[in-house]
């Protein structure tokens, strides 16, 4: 049902990485526009992206208010140029999104190795603590601030001269590993949230190798 030539949105999909969260949907509009509403399970609906011809809406500002809440969005379809018009039941056509809980579902972005420093036979590898758009007391929180000990990093490291990898874990953003003196090593890290059932792991960081500019060596 609905007004002539107006179709309901479909394939509503949450795209979220490190809490940057966009709702996407289809179809590309032909003679129609969309408005999005978002709500927590117990809250009021808030309208966003009014009468847009886009098929995406950035809802980050809403979800970062409480990343542990579960959100629902809906996309309303209106005839272009006649946004007051409603469907046959007296309401505009709309479609609901799947529920979305940012803390449990946002994808972990690709991490970055900030630095590594060798002191004798030890190397300290530091992972960049990426800033998110989640705020507390008017400051942006880092990924570690948000997830705390729920977030771990896995380090993969190997001698530049061989293919055999080793691994280590940390629930901070730093690794201290043993290496053979005089050998160059390469490093890659991955973020993991062990308690999750979906979107548990990030992709691996870019590989960084000793002898390149991010590193520092001290006897």
């Amino acid at each position: 049902s609905g007004t002539t030539n107006t179709v309901a949105a479909y394939n509503l999909t949450w795209k979220s990485t490190n809490f940057k969260t966009i709702l996407e949907w289809e179809p590309k509009p032909v003679n129609q526009v969309y408005t999005v509403q978002i709500s927590t399970k117990s809250g009021d609906w808030k309208s966003k992206c009014f009468y847009t011809t886009d098929t995406e809406c950035d809802l980050t500002d809403e979800i970062v208010k409480d990343v542990k809440q579960t959100y629902l969005a809906r996309v309303f379809s209106y005839p272009a140029g006649n946004v007051e018009s409603t469907g046959s039941a007296g309401e505009p056509l709309y479609e609901n999104s799947p529920e979305f809980t940012p803390y449990l579902e946002t994808n972990l972005g690709q991490p970055t190795i900030q630095s590594f420093e060798q002191v004798g036979t030890k190397v300290n590898v530091t992972v960049e603590d990426e800033r998110t758009l989640v705020r507390r007391n008017n400051t942006f929180l880092s990924l570690r601030d948000v997830f705390g000990k729920d977030l771990i990093y896995t380090l993969y490291y190997w001698k530049s001269s061989s293919s055999g990898k080793k691994t280590a874990k940390t629930n901070t953003n730093e690794f201290l590993i043993d290496v053979d003196k005089g050998e160059n090593y390469c490093f890659s890290v991955q973020a993991v949230i062990p308690s999750r059932t979906v979107n548990r792991k990030s992709t691996d960081s870019p590989v960084e190798c000793m002898g390149q500019e991010k590193g520092e060596f001290r006897e």
């Epitope: 990898k165 940390t170 308690s195 979906v198």
Partner: antibody, heavy 117, light 107 residues
């Protein structure tokens, strides 16, 4: 329901090879790390290695580095262990296990590999 | 590689006894230490992870403590179903290594 089913064990001649399979159901192996662990008769648990099926990273216990290859076919939701140059002391039950990154939460019933002439 | 030394290798106890098993790592493993239980001919299952966290569905009579290199599994009041072999595992760095196991038998 999460299930891991190992297969491919049996009697192998010393110096021979085998390929064990670990078919997973009830979850996507790409979301986890998959390990191989073995237990010789009457002995303790011994770690062989792991794979991150999504990224393809593999890590081995150095004692198996030259003889073991762990792989995964994500389209079949299956992990594999290839072991070469087998010797009598490789006789064991081989288990695959799912690792959350905090602990092994599921593993299979194991498949017995006997190396004997 | 990190060596895990578990003791005792076996112990005899009675139902209702308090049982303590220890595991020592050859260097600091930062609480990346899990305890598993294995019954004869059966699967092994996680009891404790991150040294002190009780796994889902595990009775509260099991507890874990320790940090650095020294860790302990305690069964506050041994039950008939607890007669089994217990293993500690470190998973902070590769290769993952296990203790030799502690077999808990009926006295």
């Amino acid at each position: 329901e999460v299930q891991l089913v190992e297969s491919g064990g049996g009697l192998v001649q010393p110096g021979g090879s085998l390929r064990l399979s670990c078919a997973a159901s009830g979850f996507n192996i790409k979301e986890y790390y998959m390990h191989w662990v073995r237990q010789a008769p009457g002995k303790g648990l011994e770690w062989v290695g792991l794979i991150d099926p999504e990224q393809g990273n593999t890590i081995y216990d150095p004692k198996f580095q030259d003889r073991a290859t762990i792989s995964a076919d994500n389209s079949k939701n299956t992990a594999y262990l290839q072991m070469n140059s087998l010797r009598a002391e490789d006789t064991a039950v081989y288990y695959c296990a799912r690792d959350t990154a905090a602990y092994f939460d599921y593993h299979g019933q194991g498949t017995l590999v006997t190396v004997s002439s | 590689d990190i060596q895990m030394t578990q003791s005792p290798s076996s112990l005899s106890a009675s139902v209702g006894d308090r049982v303590t098993i220890t595991c020592r790592a050859s260097r600091d493993i930062k609480s990346y230490l899990n305890w598993y239980q294995q019954k004869p001919g059966k699967a092994w299952k996680v009891l404790i992870y991150y040294a002190t966290s009780l796994a889902e569905g595990v009775p509260s009579r099991f507890s874990g403590s320790g940090s650095g290199t020294d860790y302990t599994l305690t069964i506050s009041s041994l039950q008939p179903e607890d007669f089994a072999t217990y293993y500690c595992w470190q998973h902070g760095e590769s290769p993952w290594t296990a203790g030799q196991g502690t077999k808990v038998e009926i006295k």
